[in-house]
Each structure stands twice: as structure tokens, then as C-alpha cells.
């Protein structure tokens, strides 16, 4: 009579994290009598998994009726798989005696643990940055097995080149994180662009997960400002507008100095938006001409998300009859409350 | 293919610990035995221990006392520190990766590292 | 803890010629499986020790066929059908059924 063979037809098996596992081994004779015992690992230091004579295997059952005198199938079910499971499992037949002896091995069984990546976080800098500048935001992922995984990065569709990636460990483990820092040039048009990180992994089939974060949380675009004079309302006043334009984010507080003194401080409220996110919002003066005997010099300064102020200035000459004109100036911090001025803003 | 190298200091002084490292390169810790074995001069080869990939070890008795080995899976690197040294534990220390599959024995000490020479001097 | 002995100590060898090691364990390395775990190793001078046989008869991979491992029990036997230059070196017995692994003390190959 031939020699009884154990037969682990599989040589691997890969399972999703919490599904079940079945390690399938027949033997080829019912002699020797003895049971079987299925282990994890080979040699000293191999871990019993399963033993059809005695024991309490909670996460173990046998697919078919081991009990019964002529089954020769041992196959086992592991539940609730986790990465921690991975290892190559033997199902090894023992000779009955006192105490049973080891009698053959299967050629042994690779299970490996397919677990998902969580979904990816990406997060940018810490402070806003300008147009130009160039900014990095890092996407991570964890817990996922194998370690095999690609993850690419995109900018409104459009894929980014300038990122570095890692994988830890670099050894062995039941489960994986991916760390990437990408990157990316801000525009003056990046208030309404997305940095996506996308991750792709042998677990999701072909449907990669993504994790997004917005530009605007990102970007600082300064505002150009426009200061005018308009046509006269009255024979004793003139209109100034100061025009602020493409500017984010909204936080914004303006000030009108007269030669240098505060006149009206005001904080951008009912603003206009753009196209591309950014803002536009108007500030006015109307300045009583009369009541001063020398040019006046008129600057509109704006304070912008914390920022250094930035200003514009315009000369109002009031020997003459007021016409539109304009300057540039530097910026001035000088403050007193001035009469004889009034503003407004839209 | 597989390579294993050993590194630590090659002088270590009587009564202090003897630390090695050795690092596997190009392959994987899972389903083997990564184990130490020492040389000393002109004489034949002795079985220091091992570590199994699930973290059981195993010491030669005759050392068991002064001898830990641990695995760092992470970094793919396996470890031997060796407490109270003495001139008798000068010797090339050798880290070895060791095959089983075939039961309850071993398969044979497939890779070895190149030998890092450790002499106990004061 | 299992006892290695090697014989003989140095083996003076001709090139071309067979050779024969031969190792003993103070108990049997057959375990109820059908394997008997007995490795065999050459160290050439130099350099670190190189797998040849494991399980008593089975050449490790890249192991030249003119070495061959027989034996079962406690004594087993290593064979060189022709011995060649590179051949030179220390070899080793070493049992692998149960730790303490224990090595033989060495037999010296060199050429005559």
C-alpha cells in the first residue's frame, strides 16, 4: 500500500482583513491512525493552531466532518483574519501513540492579509503663502498590507511630478503606512484649485481613494489697490474711492489717512467675488475742500490677513478746482482723527 | 538574493556587553530562523542562538544566562547582546538565516553573514 | 545536548581522487517524520561557512554533484566523488533535529 502523502494543494492564499480563511489539506490514507495538527511556522518554534484531538481553537472549525472514521479532509476555516495572521501554515499528520509522534508534513500553505489603506489625509502648511511661492502638503495613509501601493498626486486634474514618498517600515510588518510630501508653485488664480493625493492599493479594486485639500485654505492672494478721484457732487466737496481688488482671503480692514492722520478705519464686509474666488470691494470719501486752506494728502491703507499694511495716496489740491488725479506712495502709520471728512464704503 | 551583514564594535572590554546587529537585505524575515554563531581562533564553530520570525528564541544553555537576541522586523535586523564578556567570548561572530519547513526540525543554514571579529581586551 | 563527533580530523586528499567525512550523534537525528536533520558545511579559508547538504542527503541549491550526503540515525556520511582544488577547507557536521544545535569538530580537507 503507498504511504500516506499530506496534501496542501494551495501554496498561497490571500484573505481580506476580517473575512475568513480556509487552509485546505487531504490526506491520501487513513493509515496511520493519528490525528491531524495544523501549525503555524516550521521547527522549534512553531505555533499549534489547530489540534483535531484536543483543545479549544475558538476561531477554528474544520470544513468538513473530521470526526467521522473515513474523512481524509482536514481543511480548516480561520474567522475574523488579521494582518497578525499572515505566516505559512503546515498541516502535519501525527502516528497515534503515547505520546503521538509527527508523522508528515504538508508542503505548507502562505497566507498573506489584504487590509485596506485608510482613507488619506492631506495637509498643507501651516501659514498662507503668495502666488509664487512654493508650498508642500504631505498625504498619509495607514494600516494597509501588502506593502505594495502607488500613490500619485494631482493639482485640478492634473498630475504633479515634484513629490517624495515613503513606505514604512521598511521591513517586515502585519501592516503599512504611506507618507508623501508633494510640492506644488501657488497662482494668483489657486483660490478655487485642489491638491488631490490619490491612493491606489491591491485591496480596492481598481477604485482608488482620495484625499483632498483646498488651495484657499492655502493661498493668500494681496490686493491691488486703485485710489480715484471722482467728478465734483458739490461746489465744496469731492468724492475719493479707493478700489480694492483681487484679494483673499476677505479679512481686511482699511484706513484713510489725511496728511498722515487717521481719519476712518473700516473693515471689508459686503465685498464682491470674482471669477477665480478672489475678492473686489470699495471704500469712498467725501471730502469737504473747503474747510482746508493747503493740498491734502489722502492714502488709502489696507491691511490684509495680518499683513503689513499697503497703501496709495492721492493729492488733493484744493487752490484750484478739483480734477481726478493720482499717486503712489509708501506706506504711512501715523493716526489723529480728522473733521470735515466723510466716507463710506460698497 | 539574500544578504546578511553583521556590525558592532570589534573591541569590547572585559565584564561589559557585547552588542551586534545584523541586517537582512534583499529578502524577507518571515518563516525563518535568524540565529548567531561564534568562532574563536583557530577552533570549530558554536550555535549562540536564535530568533524565530514570530519572536520565540531559542539559547544555547551553556550562554543562556549572558545572551539576548531580538528581532526588529520593522528595520530588518536581528540582534545579539551578550553581557559579562570575558577573553574566553573573543571570536568572529557570524549571523546566519536558517530554513524550516519540514516539521519540527530545521532545514539547513542556507545564508550567512561574512563574520565580524569581536576581541574582549582591556 | 547532543554529541557531533567527526572523523577524521584532517583529510590529506589528490586532486581528481574520492574522498569520504564521516560524523556520529550521540542519538538519533531519524525523527518519527523520516527526516533525519544533519546538516553538512565547508568553511574554505577565510571565509564564512557555505551550506552543502541538508537533511542528511539533499544538495543545497548551487552545491556541486559530486558532493552527496548519506546516512540515517546517529551515523551519517559525506562523499566527494572527485575532489578539486576548491574543495579545500574545514568541514562541518551539524544537527538540526533539536537546540542546542551542536556542531562536529571539523574535518581539515587539503590537498596532498
Known amino acids: 500500500e503507498e504511504e500516506l502523502q499530506v496534501i496542501q494543494p494551495d501554496k498561497s492564499v490571500s484573505v481580506a482583513a476580517g473575512e475568513s480563511a480556509i487552509l485546505h489539506c487531504t490526506v491520501t490514507s487513513l493509515i496511520p491512525v493519528g490525528p491531524i495538527q495544523w501549525f503555524r511556522g516550521a521547527g522549534p518554534a512553531r505555533e499549534l493552531i489547530y489540534n483535531q484531538k484536543e483543545g479549544h481553537f475558538p476561531r477554528v472549525t474544520t470544513v468538513s466532518e473530521s470526526t467521522k472514521r473515513e474523512n481524509m479532509d482536514f481543511s480548516i476555516s480561520i474567522s475574523n483574519i488579521t494582518p497578525a495572521d499572515a505566516g505559512t501554515y503546515y498541516c502535519v499528520k501525527f502516528r497515534k501513540g503515547s505520546p503521538d509522534t509527527e508523522f508528515k508534513s504538508g508542503a505548507g500553505t502562505e497566507l498573506s492579509v489584504r487590509a485596506k489603506p485608510s482613507a488619506p489625509v492631506v495637509s498643507g502648511p501651516a501659514a498662507r503663502a503668495t502666488p509664487q511661492h512654493t508650498v508642500s502638503f504631505t498625504c498619509e495613509s495607514h494600516g494597509f498590507s501588502p506593502r505594495d501601493i502607488t500613490l500619485k498626486w494631482f493639482k485640478n486634474g492634473n498630475e504633479l511630478s515634484d513629490f517624495q514618498t515613503n513606505v514604512d517600515p521598511v521591513g517586515e510588518s502585519v501592516s503599512y503606512s504611506i507618507h508623501s510630501t508633494a510640492k506644488v508653485v501657488l497662482t494668483r488664480e489657486d483660490v478655487h484649485s485642489q491638491v488631490i493625493c490619490e491612493v491606489a492599493h491591491v485591496t480596492l479594486q481598481g477604485d482608488p481613494l482620495r484625499g483632498t485639500a483646498n488651495l484657499s485654505e492655502t493661498i493668500r492672494v494681496p490686493p491691488t489697490l486703485e485710489v480715484t478721484q471722482q467728478p465734483v457732487r458739490a461746489e465744496n466737496q469731492v468724492n475719493v474711492t479707493c478700489q480694492v481688488r483681487k484679494f483673499y482671503p476677505q479679512r481686511l480692514q482699511l484706513t484713510w489717512l489725511e496728511n498722515g492722520n487717521v481719519s476712518r478705519t473700516e473693515t471689508a464686509s459686503t465685498v464682491t467675488e470674482n471669477k477665480d474666488g478672489t475678492y473686489n470691494w470699495m471704500s469712498w470719501l467725501l471730502v469737504n475742500v473747503s474747510a482746508h486752506r493747503d493740498d491734502v494728502k489722502l492714502t488709502c491703507q489696507v491691511e490684509h490677513d495680518g499683513q503689513p499694511a499697503v497703501s496709495k495716496s492721492h493729492d488733493l489740491k484744493v487752490s484750484a478746482h478739483p480734477k481726478e488725479q493720482g499717486s503712489n506712495t509708501a506706506a504711512e502709520n501715523t493716526g489723529s482723527n480728522e473733521r470735515n471728512i466723510y466716507g463710506g464704503s460698497g | 538574493q539574500v544578504q546578511l551583514q553583521e556590525s558592532g564594535p570589534g573591541l569590547v572590554r572585559p565584564s561589559e556587553t557585547l552588542s551586534l546587529t545584523c541586517t537582512v537585505s534583499?529578502?524577507?524575515?518571515?518563516?525563518?530562523?535568524w540565529s548567531w554563531i561564534r568562532q574563536p581562533p583557530g577552533k570549530g564553530l558554536e550555535w549562540i542562538g536564535f530568533i524565530y520570525y514570530n519572536g520565540r528564541t531559542f539559547y544555547n544553555p551553556s550562554l543562556k544566562s549572558r545572551v539576548t537576541i531580538s528581532l526588529d522586523k520593522s528595520k530588518n535586523q536581528f540582534s545579539l547582546k551578550m553581557t559579562s564578556v570575558t577573553a574566553a567570548d573573543t571570536a568572529v561572530y557570524y549571523c546566519a538565516r536558517v530554513r524550516a519547513y519540514s516539521g519540527i526540525g530545521l532545514d539547513g543554514t542556507d545564508v550567512w553573514g561574512q563574520g565580524t571579529t569581536v576581541t574582549v581586551s582591556s | 545536548d547532543i554529541v557531533m563527533t567527526q572523523s577524521p580530523l584532517s583529510l590529506p586528499v589528490t586532486p581528481g581522487e574520492p574522498a569520504s567525512i564521516s560524523c556520529k550523534s550521540s542519538q538519533s537525528l531519524l525523527y518519527s517524520n523520516g527526516y533525519a536533520y544533519l546538516d553538512w558545511y565547508l568553511q574554505r579559508p577565510g571565509q564564512s561557512p557555505q551550506l552543502l547538504i541538508y537533511l542528511g542527503s539533499n544538495r543545497a541549491s548551487g552545491v556541486p554533484d559530486r558532493f552527496s550526503g548519506s546516512g540515517s540515525g546517529t551515523d551519517f556520511t559525506l562523499k566527494i566523488s572527485r575532489v578539486e582544488a576548491e574543495d579545500v577547507g574545514v568541514y562541518y557536521c551539524m544537527q538540526a533535529l533539536q537546540t542546542p544545535l551542536t556542531f562536529g569538530g571539523g574535518t581539515k580537507v587539503e590537498i596532498k
Open positions: 534583499g529578502g524577507s524575515i518571515r518563516n525563518y530562523y
